[in-house]
Interface confidence: medium
């Protein structure tokens, strides 16, 4: 808590400018009007304040807005955002995507902090669902964002938002998450032609059921081994040798390199040796 002291004569701030960097903490507290600070927040980031000075500015805003900052202030917080606690952020009502982008930019290149997680949570809850623009923004800043959501949270993602998802956004998703995302992707891409559909759906196939894999095997898709290895074991097991051969196409040779790993290992054990022999790869059931 900064002690209340009178502002020295002639030091009352008329605007937020670089002269304030020479103010001691108590002078900032005494000489900067909170309302002036709120209206000129966009200037704060251009001024090289110390962390201690930023603490004072935050304190002034907290006094002015005890119920939480208005969005006009939040949008221009800049580096002052890093001083906010999750408790501070829970008081906010952030509705503008521009505000979200501005604050994510401040944290760019760092792991998702508790502050950022709280901000995103407040924003998404305020919108009611993860729309395409929001998902676009969040995955641009945090490629792993989608996979950080629970299956329950993912269920609120509308199929239209799936268009924003890039393959790398799904790298850390587990099978339960892909189980939720795959039907949405299937719906989102349903009107695409065969080859384009496969390119888009490929990253989501870890949630595909057996019948969809069987259907893909009839379409000459040449699935690569990395994608095949991410398929659900229970979805792969019922596939016949002929179906796997058609599904993988030229990549079928890769089964030999992966024969000790799931789901290939488990699938091999389910096949008749005579059928495996037809692959010509020397796989042993």
């Amino acid at each position: 808590e900064v002690e209340k002291t009178a502002c020295p004569s002639g030091k009352k701030a008329r605007e937020i400018d670089e002269s304030l960097i020479f103010y001691k903490k108590w002078e900032l507290e005494a000489c900067v009007d909170a309302a002036l600070l709120a209206t000129q927040m966009d200037r704060v980031n251009a001024i090289p304040f110390t962390y201690e000075q930023l603490d004072v500015l935050k304190h002034k805003l907290d006094e002015l807005y005890p119920q939480g900052y208005p969005e006009s202030v939040i949008q221009h917080l800049g580096y002052l955002f890093l001083k906010m606690s999750p408790e501070d952020i829970r008081k906010w009502n952030v509705t503008s995507l521009e505000t979200l982008k501005a604050l994510l930019e401040v944290n760019k290149g760092h792991e998702m902090s508790p502050q950022v997680a709280t901000l995103i949570d407040r924003f998404v809850k305020g919108r009611g669902q993860l729309d395409k623009d929001t998902l676009d923004t969040l995955t641009a800043f945090y490629p792993g964002y989608l996979c950080s959501l629970s299956p329950e949270e993912l269920s609120s993602v509308p199929p239209s938002s799936i268009w924003a998802v890039r393959p790398q956004d799904l790298d850390t998703c587990d099978p339960r998450q892909l189980d939720v995302l795959y039907p949405k992707a299937r719906l989102a891409f349903q009107n695409m032609n065969g080859s384009e559909y496969f390119v888009k759906i490929q990253s989501f196939l870890g949630g595909a059921p057996t019948e969809d894999l069987k259907a893909l095997s009839q379409q000459n898709v040449s699935m690569d081994l990395a994608t095949f290895m991410k398929l659900r074991t229970d979805a792969v097991l019922p596939l016949t040798v002929a179906e796997v051969q058609k599904l993988l196409g030229p990549h079928v040779e890769g089964l030999k390199a992966e024969e000790r790993h799931r789901p290939v290992r488990d699938w091999i054990l389910r096949q008749r040796q005579d059928d495996l022999d037809t692959l010509g790869l020397g796989l042993q059931g």
């Epitope: 065969g194 898709v221 690569d224 990395a226 994608t227 030229p250």
Partner: antibody, heavy 115, light 110 residues
Framework: EVQLVESGGGLVQPGGSLRLSCAAS????????MHWVRQAPGKGLEWVAY????????YYADSVKGRFTISADTSKNTAYLQMNSLRAEDTAVYYC????????WGQGTLVTVSS | DIQMTQSPSSLSASVGDRVTITCRAS??????VAWYQQKPGKAPKLLIY???SLYSGVPSRFSGSRSGTDFTLTISSLQPEDFATYYC????????????FGQGTKVEIK
């Protein structure tokens, strides 16, 4: 020991034809894919064509589609590349390579297309 | 068609240096990515397949990794015999099977 030996390269005029051979030993090409990859003088690698005899798969790079044909004679354990309508830009060392990750390569054979 | 953009095109390094070469795919790409070493007048040699699997007989100082559409070859401690040209290569999945090579990176002695 796995070995691949290319032959059939040489000097040919634009519009002419040439057939390259890739004799394999140490494995059965019937059960493996075979690729042709070329390298123009001082340039990088360019994939040309692929065959997987067991499944009768053949694939080609757009730059050679309709002019080159890849084939295999499994009784001779040899893959071939029939090159027709040759152009100056086809001048390169042609390598054959084996398998899923191109794990074995031949020493290469030089094809020069010039008048 | 998918392009594999390899960088840098050349680099100078000393024995013992850590060297990193990157290939960026122009679009969503499978992990069927391999790395090769080629010395003048010789055929390429396989180093890494499936993005990160070390080929048998290849020294453990070579490693491969993937992050999204970026694929990286790392030589942890450069040896005299490692001065060569390195290529990345991708085998596409999808309807049109094709193989694409990066432009190559020449690793020279500083």
């Amino acid at each position: 020991e796995v070995q691949l030996v290319e032959s059939g390269g040489g000097l040919v005029q634009p519009g002419g034809s040439l057939r390259l051979s890739c004799a394999a030993s140490g494995f059965n090409i019937y059960y493996s894919s075979m690729h042709w990859v070329r390298q123009a003088p001082g340039k990088g690698l360019e994939w040309v064509a692929y065959i997987y005899p067991y499944y009768s798969y053949t694939y080609y790079a757009d730059s050679v589609k309709g002019r080159f044909t890849i084939s295999a004679d499994t009784s001779k354990n040899t893959a071939y590349l029939q090159m027709n309508s040759l152009r100056a830009e086809d001048t390169a060392v042609y390598y054959c390579a084996r398998g899923y990750a191109l794990d074995y390569w031949g020493q290469g054979t030089l094809v020069t297309v010039s008048s | 068609d998918i392009q594999m953009t390899q960088s840098p095109s050349s680099l100078s390094a000393s024995v013992g240096d850590r060297v990193t070469i990157t290939c960026r795919a122009s679009q969503s790409v499978s992990s069927a990515v391999a790395w090769y070493q080629q010395k003048p007048g010789k055929a390429p040699k396989l180093l890494i397949y499936s993005a990160s699997s070390l080929y048998s007989g290849v020294p453990s100082r070579f490693s491969g990794s993937r992050s999204g559409t970026d694929f990286t070859l790392t030589i942890s401690s450069l040896q005299p015999e490692d001065f060569a040209t390195y290529y990345c290569q991708q085998a596409s999945s999808g309807y049109h099977y094709l193989i694409t090579f990066g432009q190559g990176t020449k690793v020279e002695i500083k």
